[in-house]
């Protein structure tokens, strides 16, 4: 999906009002410096691409974050503020339902969510200096 035509300000507002808090809740008890940055993004569409990938694609050691509160709110924000996003996710959602497993918060998942926090911060940050 190409995130170029999303309403970035509306997504930013959704992040600031709820998603950020859910990410913090998930990471509670974890030091903010515990994980180094291993993923970055270079503009807002790129950030959303990487956020979608880390949030909804299973990875080794972290089978699925998609049922977490922050993930469901992320999905809702993208569905509302990114034209055509919902249609692209129907097949992925059906596949995900078949894979549903019990919820276990592994260290790998904590690391992944830490990376998500970093991506969201980059998505939202103002560029302080134009160089």
């Amino acid at each position: 999906y190409d995130f170029t035509n999303c309403d970035f300000e509306k997504i930013k507002a959704a992040y600031l009002s709820t998603i950020s808090k859910d990410l913090i809740t998930y990471m509670s008890g974890t030091k903010s410096t515990e994980f180094n940055n291993t993923v970055s993004c270079s503009n807002r569409p790129h950030c959303l691409t990487e956020i979608q990938s880390l949030t909804f694609n299973p990875t080794a050691g972290c089978a699925s974050l998609a049922k977490e509160m922050f993930a469901m709110k992320t999905k809702a924000a993208l569905a509302i503020w990114c034209p055509g996003y919902s249609e692209t996710q129907i097949n992925a959602t059906q596949a995900m339902k078949k894979r549903r497993k019990r919820k276990v918060t592994t260290n790998k998942c904590l690391e992944q969510v830490s990376q998500l926090q970093g991506l969201w911060r980059r998505f939202n940050r103002p560029l302080l200096k134009q160089q």
Epitope: N37, S40, S42, R122, Q130, Q131
Partner: antibody, heavy 122, light 108 residues
Framework: QMQLVESGGGVVQPGRSLRLSCAAS????????MHWVRQAPGKGLEWVAV????????HYADSVKGRFTITRDNSKNTLNLQMNSLRAEDTAVYYC???????????????WGQGTMVTVSS | SYVLTQPPSVSVAPGQTARITCGGN??????VHWYQQKPGQAPVLVVY???DRPSWIPERFSGSNSGNTATLTISRGEAGDEADYYC???????????FGGGTKLTVL
């Protein structure tokens, strides 16, 4: 563990070519800008080139423009520097370094390789 | 092209504060990064975006930037701080990375 490992250095005659490589591991390579920086013996750091996270754009120092080419292969997590028409003044340790970027701005180089020595001598 | 000027050397007594400057035309409008390099080793980022510090760098390292001068401050200097220090910026007008000439810090 995040790591950059350079290879390909060696002794080469003036006018000849050399290709350096940098293998990345422990991070999502395709999301970072990547630089080459060199350091002549006993001298300071000199920036050489940078390639955008997706390989779409490159920028070069005037001293190497037209002679060096920076490329990346995101499927293999590798960065390359093709060095042609080498000169004695290209003798240096060559480092690769990663750098987050925002739009067209490259940020600090937060991870560096250990460097590979290139000696241009007849 | 943009030029960054650093003093070749700075000395500090153990436990005292060292300040390394980096001069450039209106450098305060740019983000400045600082690197430490010990002999035979690769550079290490110690301060980025003027004053931010990577999680692995001690709080003794700090930075500031305004006007025509950026400054790296190392408080409570230790023998292990002896190294070359380089400032760096990204010059958007020319799409180039610019490094300062480097400053050798000696802990007396």
């Amino acid at each position: 563990q995040m790591q950059l490992v350079e290879s390909g250095g060696g002794v080469v005659q003036p006018g000849r070519s050399l290709r350096l490589s940098c293998a990345a591991s422990g991070f999502t390579f395709r999301t970072y800008g990547m630089h080459w920086v060199r350091q002549a013996p006993g001298k300071g750091l000199e920036w050489v080139a940078v390639v955008w996270y997706d390989g779409s754009y490159t920028h070069y120092a005037d001293s190497v423009k037209g002679r060096f080419t920076i490329t990346r292969d995101n499927s293999k997590n590798t960065l390359n520097l093709q060095m042609n028409s080498l000169r004695a003044e290209d003798t240096a340790v060559y480092y690769c370094a990663r750098s987050p970027q925002w739009e067209e701005i490259f940020e600090a180089m937060d991870i560096w390789g250990q460097g590979t020595m290139v000696t241009v001598s007849s | 092209s943009y030029v960054l000027t650093q003093p070749p050397s700075v000395s500090v007594a153990p436990g005292q504060t060292a300040r390394i400057t980096c001069g450039g035309n209106n450098i305060g409008s740019k983000s400045v990064h600082w690197y430490q390099q010990k002999p035979g080793q690769a550079p290490v980022l110690v301060v980025y975006d003027d004053s931010d510090r990577p999680s692995w760098i001690p709080e003794r390292f700090s930075g500031s930037n305004s006007g025509n001068t950026a400054t790296l401050t190392i408080s409570r200097g230790e023998a292990g701080d002896e190294a070359d220090y380089y400032c760096q910026i990204w010059d958007s007008s020319s799409s180039l990375v610019v490094f300062g000439g480097g400053t050798k810090l000696t802990v007396l």
